[in-house]
């Protein structure tokens, strides 16, 4: 079944290469287990950046080695991507799946364009 997901159109990463935005999905109702996947679209190519499953009983938990962190509250997920470089500029799409209990719902946002500007190296001081 289809479900709406919303995310901001544009986000500027910090000088440290960190970008945060909220992914909000159509009310989860009685969804107990939700999977959130961050996808990066470059041209026609779609790659998975990170993913996490959380339950209404627990906090959102990404793998320890993940480039993402996040917190969940109701039908909103606050996602943070770390370690971004200029070449990481692109469209980041939030995909939300209501996994359990049935019925299964899936929703994808229109994407957040994240702009990453690598900091200028400091000039050598004499």
């Amino acid at each position: 079944k289809g479900m709406h997901a919303a995310q901001p159109a544009v986000v500027l990463a910090s000088s440290r290469g960190v970008a945060s935005f909220v992914c909000e999905y159509g009310s989860s109702g009685n969804a107990a287990e939700v999977r959130v996947t961050m996808l990066r679209q470059a041209g026609s190519q779609m790659t998975e950046v990170c993913a996490a499953t959380y339950t209404v009983e627990d906090e959102l938990a990404f793998l320890d080695d993940s480039t993402c962190t996040g917190t969940s509250s109701g039908n909103k997920v606050n996602l943070t991507i770390q370690g971004l470089r200029a070449m990481g500029t692109g469209l980041y799409i939030c995909k939300v799946e209501l996994m359990y209990p049935p019925p299964y719902y899936v929703g994808m946002g229109n994407g957040t364009q994240i702009y990453v500007i690598d900091p200028e190296p400091c000039p050598d001081s004499d």
Partner: antibody, heavy 116, light 112 residues
């Protein structure tokens, strides 16, 4: 403190109707499905079905399709189980239970006795 | 419908001894997301059931580590490493993977 308090159990004659209540407190009622479980005297637990407290959509196990109705009053944080055309075999303790990915919270159970 | 078959129907164990209850499902209870929603509940006379184990092997908060769950696919086990007097009651397995969700028939644990 999360609580499910049940009421409505009674001695009812065959052919009659009854409505059992399950009042929830201590959490957001519409975030969790409410399930109903039957336990006949000296028997095991039998899953009757559940109702989505957000959409109001019920799901019934095959044995409980027809005479059984799950309903809600979200303003009162209460789930109901209505049983019509009562039979002797409906005599049981009925539990409501809140489910996420498990049942951590149960009502205390309410006893329905169907007898003439 | 998935039938959950528990064995034995009853068992009598001395305090300090281990106990094991088996639960077999009539078909795989792996849900479409890869999880197995298999739970164990304990019920004492006149009381509501209490959750012990969820998703096969996860102990619910406050449940003593004497209780453990294991298994996969269609075969599952609840183990009590050292039985105590307070463990007497009826134990039920439950599958929440495929509607209609179903309970096992129950196993009565008696303490010698």
């Amino acid at each position: 403190e999360i609580q499910l308090v049940q009421s409505g159990g009674d001695l009812v004659k065959p052919g009659g109707s009854v409505r059992l209540s399950c009042k929830a407190s201590g959490y957001t009622f519409t975030n969790y499905g409410m399930n109903w479980v039957k336990q006949a005297p000296g028997k095991g637990l039998q899953w009757m079905g559940w109702i989505n407290t957000y959409t109001g959509e019920p799901t019934y196990a095959d044995d409980f399709k027809g005479r059984f109705t799950f309903s809600l009053d979200n303003a009162k944080n209460t789930a109901y189980l209505q049983i019509n055309s009562l039979r002797a075999e409906d005599t049981a303790v009925y539990f409501c239970a809140r489910r996420s990915i498990y049942y951590p919270y149960w009502g205390q159970g309410t006893t329905l006795t169907v007898s003439s | 419908d998935i039938v959950m078959t528990q064995t034995p129907l009853s068992l009598s164990v001395s305090p300090g001894e281990p106990a094991s209850i088996s639960c077999r499902s009539s078909q795989s209870i792996v849900y479409s997301n890869g999880n197995t929603y298999l739970e164990w509940y304990q019920q004492k006379p006149g009381q509501s059931p209490k959750l012990l184990i969820y998703k096969v092997s996860n102990r619910f908060s406050g449940v003593p580590d004497r209780f453990s769950g294991s298994g996969s696919g269609t075969d599952f086990t609840l183990r009590i490493s050292r039985v105590e007097a307070d463990d007497a009651g009826v134990y039920y397995c439950f599958q929440g993977s495929h509607v209609p969700w179903t309970f096992g028939g129950g196993t009565k644990l008696e303490i010698k």
